[in-house]
Each structure stands twice: as C-alpha cells, then as structure tokens.
Interface confidence: low
C-alpha cells in the first residue's frame, strides 16, 4: 500500500477518506488505527457500529469519529480539534473475524494555524495564538506520498 498524506491545520478538523470496493468488503465492519512505530502494531482508535447495517451512524472515540458509506464504498474518519500529537501513521482497516485488511495507509500531518502568529496591534484577539477549531474538510489536502519522499515536519 502507498501512503496517502492528509494535511490538517492545528485546531481545525481533518477529514480522512478511505475508498474501498464495496462488494469485496460487503458486510465487514471497518476500523481506524494508529501505527505504533514503523513495524509495531496498529492500535485501534475507533471502529464502525457493531451492527454493519448501522455503519452509517457516526461513532466517536474522544475527538475521532468514524462513519462508513457501505454502498458508495467510502470510510470517513474525522479528527476533530487536530493537535500536533495527532500527527503520525494510521490505517483504515476492513475487519473480518480476528483479521484486518488494510484499506489505506494514511500519514496525518499537522500544519500551523494560519492565524496563530498575528501581530495585529490593537486588533490582536485575546488568545489569538490559540488555534482554530474544526474548520472542515473542504481544505483538507490529500496527496500520494512518493516512494522515498520525506514528508515535511508535521508541526512548525
């Protein structure tokens, strides 16, 4: 699997999409896990509803949500109030029994809040160095990570 990079801004929401073959993965629950080290295990963060027919219902674990369009074949993960510590490698998984197939490997990069450094004199907002919250997916950026490419540092 190639790794797909999703870039989000600190404090905003980042939406990660994982497309899959809806027929091949029919009836399977999905999960989002965080890779612990390069060759370590993938630690489950959140999974879709226990009843596959209700996979469209959004399920939350802390600031991470998952929902599955089983007909269209798209798993969507939302990382709300993105923080620098959210940067790292993740996987979208399709579950069957005790096994898990990788649908997509994802590298999450966290960029600086574009308004976190303003020097605005008396226009300075109290706590302006605090970041945005939850700006949505229209501007989450996705690209393929080329073989051997080094992603830029996830935080500034």
């Amino acid at each position: 699997h190639n790794t797909t990079v999703f870039q989000g801004v600190a404090g905003q929401s980042l939406q990660v999409s994982c497309p899959y073959d809806s027929m091949k993965h029919w009836g399977r629950r999905k999960a989002w896990c965080r890779q612990l080290g390069e060759k370590g295990p993938c630690q489950r963060v959140v999974s879709t509803h226990n009843l596959w027919l209700l996979s469209f219902l959004r399920r939350w674990n802390g600031s991470t949500a998952i929902t599955d369009d089983t007909l269209g074949g798209t798993l969507t993960i939302t990382l709300r109030n993105l923080q620098p510590h959210d940067a790292g490698l993740y996987q979208c998984q399709s579950l069957h029994g005790s096994e898990a197939d990788t649908l997509r490997k994802v590298l999450v990069e966290v960029l600086a809040d574009p308004l976190d450094h303003r020097d605005a004199g008396d226009l300075w907002f109290p706590g302006e160095s605090e970041s945005f919250e939850d700006a949505h997916v229209e501007h989450s950026i996705s690209r393929s990570l080329l073989e051997g490419e080094i992603p830029f540092p996830p935080t500034s």
């Epitope: 801004v9 404090g11 905003q12 929401s13 109030n81 960029l111 600086a112 574009p114 308004l115 450094h117 303003r118 020097d119 605005a120 004199g121 226009l123 300075w124 907002f125 109290p126 706590g127 302006e128 605090e130 970041s131 945005f132 919250e133 939850d134 700006a135 949505h136 229209e138 501007h139 500034s156």
Partner: antibody, heavy 118, light 112 residues
Framework: EVQLVESGGGLVQPGGSLRLSCAAS????????MSWVRQAPGKGLEWVSV??????????GYNPSVKGRFTISRDNSKNTLYLQMNSLRAEDTAVYYC?????????WGQGTLVTVSS | DIVMTQTPLSLPVTPGEPASISCQSS???????????LNWYLQKPGQSPQLLIY???TRASGVPDRFSGSGSGTDFTLKISRVEAEDVGVYYC?????????FGQGTKVEIK
C-alpha cells in the same frame, strides 16, 4: 454545499446606520471565523472585519478605517453573521461581501450593495 | 499596514498561451514557521471573488493545476500555464500575515 447569502444593503444618508446580514449554510457555523470584505464600485477589495469562532470566544477585529463605527456580530442559533454600520460616510459606499475565513477567504457570498449618499 | 502592489494592472492574453501576474509586498510575508502568507483570488466578471492559491503556492480546492503560485518573501508570481477563456477577470493578491489584511489593486486579465 457551503452557501453565504447577504442582505440588508440599500441607500442611506451620510451619518446614517445600516445592518447587514449574512445567512450561512452547509457547514458548522460556530466552528469558523467569519469576515466582511467590501469593494467600492469599480475598485479593489478591502478587508473590513473578522469575528472568531466558538473556540476563541467570538472575539472581533476591525480594519482601522471602520473601527469604532462598525460592529461585527453573529447569531449562532440562526447561522447568521451581521455587520452593524453606524456613522456612515460616502467612502463606505461599496458591495459588502461576507466570507468564511480558513487559509484565506475560501467562500464568499454574492454581496450586498450599500450606497451612502445624500 | 502592509502595502501590496500588483503589476501589470491590465493583461491582454491569448487563449492557450501562458500568462503571469506579479505582486510585491512592502514587508516579507515569510513567517518563521516556513509558510508564506500570500493568497491569490480571481474575481470573474459579475461574480464574487474566489480563492485560488493560499500559502503562496498551495492551490485551493477545485482550482485547476494550470494555476501556480511562486515567489520569495516579498515578490510573488501567479502563473497560468495555458490561459482559457474562463480565466478572464480580475486577479488579486492578498497578504494574510498581519491585520489589517490587505489586497493588491488587482490585475484585469482579458482576451486579446
């Protein structure tokens, strides 16, 4: 689909007041910074004001050219942004756009024309 | 305030040919975090402006890859690799580094 629809523009005499509204839909309104940008007839763009999101207390900032005369506010229960304009001057004549602010002004309304003239 | 100066103010173009617009800021827009806070917008005739480029060189969602942004701390360029008829309108650069946010005067791009 993100939509921003401005209203409230019109003809007003110098020294008068006007309140513009911007109805927002298609996104979680409370999560976003919102802004007003204006454009005088045949001229360029001028940033007017910004109001921050829920996480940052809905605090506001203004261009010095309007500070003390204009007030930006939002009614989050109605998903609506406002611009209260007082002590209007001829040079405030412009199309006023409301815009969502993320990496830049990423969504804009169609604008509402404010004419200040006696 | 940071002053943004665009050149040229008018640019006649030929469809299929490249085009280039320059923008200069009175202060460096390069922040210590490595990002350059310069945006480009296009206002098509009779329409509202639309965001084309942010952080100097990142295309906004849905913007064709014929548009590209480049530059240094104070000198910036928007390039259209092959102009199409739908690209006509007024292009604005805008600094996003400091309040008040300021725009260039605009460059009117029209078909020859």
């Amino acid at each position: 689909e993100v939509q921003l629809v401005e209203s409230g523009g019109g003809l007003v005499q110098p020294g008068g007041s006007l309140r513009l509204s911007c109805a927002a839909s298609g996104f979680t309104f409370t999560d976003f910074y919102m802004s007003w940008v204006r454009q005088a007839p045949g001229k360029g763009l001028e940033w007017v004001s910004v109001i921050r999101n829920k996480a940052n207390g809905y605090t506001a900032g203004y261009n010095p050219s309007v500070k003390g005369r204009f007030t930006i506010s939002r009614d989050n229960s109605k998903n609506t942004l406002y611009l209260q304009m007082n002590s209007l001057r001829a040079e405030d004549t412009a199309v006023y756009y409301c815009a969502r602010l993320t990496y830049g002004f990423d969504y804009w309304g169609q604008g509402t024309l404010v004419t200040v003239s006696s | 305030d940071i002053v943004m100066t665009q050149t040229p103010l008018s640019l006649p173009v030929t469809p299929g040919e490249p085009a280039s617009i320059s923008c200069q800021s009175s202060k460096s827009l390069l922040h210590s975090n490595g990002k350059t806070y310069l945006n480009w917008y296009l206002q098509k005739p009779g329409q509202s402006p639309q965001l084309l480029i942010y952080w100097m060189s990142t295309r906004a969602s849905g913007v064709p890859d014929r548009f590209s942004g480049s530059g240094s701390g104070t000198d910036f360029t928007l390039k259209i690799s092959r102009v199409e008829a739908e690209d006509v309108g007024v292009y604005y650069c805008q600094q996003f580094l400091e309040y008040p946010f300021t725009f260039g005067q605009g460059t009117k791009v029209e078909i020859k």
